[in-house]
């Protein structure tokens, strides 16, 4: 029979191949039907009968047309530091991604095995490189003329405000404090106010990183804080 009108199972022509969504069964030496996603081969084909497919059992899946005897097991439930971005169904594996404020510290073939909390830069240090799906925050000391007074995984070092008269000089962890030069705003001569800059400056803040989109599976490994690095705090 010509291949295009043959019904499975059929013997392929010499040197020929089986059609789309069919496979060559070595035992039967026939082209046989594959099973659709969400199913598996319950009974393999013979020379006279085609593949018998059955639905995947609970918590298992097949994503492709196949002739596997058993569906693949879905990954473990997502751990508390992860978000389930794709549920386990008959046709797809569960996907767990790191929740906001976390990154993938230990990846695996299909995504994340272990999430870890993003490093927080302590006062006097700002974010040099923001965290990504797969990398931690890098902190750096605030350069002269800049400061950070927060413990944050997103804040960068910001410039000190510029004062006509400085009451308290700024340092790496504190903004400069200006002396008031406007008597109408002053409660007492030379009173210190927080703050009254001459020139405004834009707030240099980083947006919070989006959660990781690397697919993965929780392996229920213990998750502790990331090891402290210079200028970081392990919360």
């Amino acid at each position: 029979l010509p291949a295009q009108v043959a019904f499975t199972p059929y013997a392929p022509e010499p040197g020929g191949t089986c059609r789309l969504r069919e496979y060559y069964d070595q035992t039967a030496q026939m082209c046989c039907s594959k099973c659709p996603p969400g199913q598996h081969a319950k009974v393999f084909c013979t020379k006279t009968s085609d593949t018998v497919c059955d639905s995947c059992e609970d918590s298992t899946y097949t994503q492709l047309w196949n002739w596997v005897p058993e569906c693949l097991s879905c990954g473990s439930r997502c751990s508390s530091d992860q978000v389930e971005t794709q549920a386990c169904t008959r046709e797809q594996n569960r996907i767990c991604t790191c929740r906001p404020g976390w990154y993938c510290a230990l990846s695996k073939q299909e995504g994340c095995r272990l999430c870890a909390q993003l490093r927080k830069c302590r006062p006097g240090f700002g974010v040099a490189r923001p965290g990504t799906e797969t990398s931690d925050v890098v902190c750096k000391p605030c350069a002269p003329g800049t400061f950070s007074n927060t413990t944050s995984s997103t804040d960068i070092c910001r410039p000190h405000q510029i004062c006509h008269v400085v009451a308290i000089p700024g340092n790496a962890s504190m903004d400069a404090v200006c002396t008031s030069t406007s008597p109408t705003r002053s409660m007492a001569p030379g009173a210190v106010h927080l703050p009254q800059p001459v020139s405004t400056r834009s707030q240099h803040t980083q947006p919070t990183p989006a959660p990781s989109t690397a697919p993965g599976t929780s392996f229920l490994l213990p998750v502790g804080p990331s090891p402290p690095a210079e200028g970081s705090t392990g919360d």
Epitope: D58, S59, R90
Partner: antibody, heavy 120, light 108 residues
Framework: QVQLVQSGAEVKKPGASVKVSCKAS????????MHWVRQAPGQGLEWIGR????????KHDPKFQDRVTMTSDTSTNTVYMELSSLRSEDTAVYYC?????????????WGQGTLVTVSS | DIQMTQSPSSLSASVGDRVTITCTAS???????LHWYQQKPGKAPKLWIY???NLPSGVPSRFSGSGSGTDFTLTISSLQPEDFATYYC?????????FGQGTKVEIK
């Protein structure tokens, strides 16, 4: 919120049949299984079977092979378990419970139970 | 069928005690498919630990679960009055799915 509400207590004679219902609310019946588990007085839990309400596919302990029938009515989100040829040892509280597909069979919500008494 | 055997069948303990319940399967069970339920008299069972070691929301952190293969345990680090109940292990690895016979935790 998720609720499973079962039908009331039944008293049956040996040889009769009983049909227990379990109405689900607060969740989509898609991608879940509904199980039936029973507990004889003073005894442990015994799994009877389960149904996929969306497809009507069932699976049960071979022990109940010829006596149990599980059905579902998707229009009312209700599943039913019928046990025939009742005997005294079928006296038990019958529970329905759900397990979401992908949760490895963990039954996270249970009905309040239906006491079935088989007595002549 | 996979038989699930719990030990002890019952135990008496005091508030504050550390309690361990074991569940032994007659053949290997994947840890994802091993669950524990708590049941109090006249009430329906409640899912207490899922997939060997995970606590559903609302279950106190004094409960923990561990194990693999054929041996699994439920541990209560410091027994509280509300923990007195019967605990059942349950395997969903192979049909027919089976429960242990239960372990009743009573007040000493």
């Amino acid at each position: 919120q998720v609720q499973l509400v079962q039908s009331g207590a039944e008293v049956k004679k040996p040889g009769a049949s009983v049909k227990v219902s379990c109405k689900a609310s607060g969740f989509n019946n898609k991608d879940i299984y509904m199980h039936w588990v029973r507990q004889a007085p003073g005894q442990g839990l015994e799994w009877i079977g389960r149904i996929d309400p969306a497809t009507g596919n069932t699976k049960h302990d071979p022990k109940f092979q010829d006596r149990v029938t599980m059905t579902s009515d998707t229009s009312t989100n209700t599943v039913y378990m019928e046990l025939s040829s009742l005997r005294s040892e079928d006296t038990a509280v019958y529970y329905c419970a759900r397990s979401p597909y992908g949760d490895f069979g963990a039954m996270d919500y249970w009905g309040q139970g239906t006491l079935v008494t088989v007595s002549s | 069928d996979i038989q699930m055997t719990q030990s002890p069948s019952s135990l008496s303990a005091s508030v504050g005690d550390r309690v361990t319940i074991t569940c032994t399967a007659s053949s290997s069970v994947s840890s994802n498919y091993l669950h524990w339920y708590q049941q109090k008299p006249g009430k329906a069972p409640k899912l207490w630990i899922y997939s060997t070691s995970n606590l559903p929301s609302g279950v106190p952190s004094r409960f923990s679960g561990s194990g693999s293969g054929t041996d699994f345990t439920l541990t209560i680090s410091s027994l509280q009055p509300e923990d007195f109940a019967t605990y059942y292990c349950h395997q969903y690895h192979r049909s027919p799915w089976t429960f242990g016979q239960g372990t009743k935790v009573e007040i000493k």
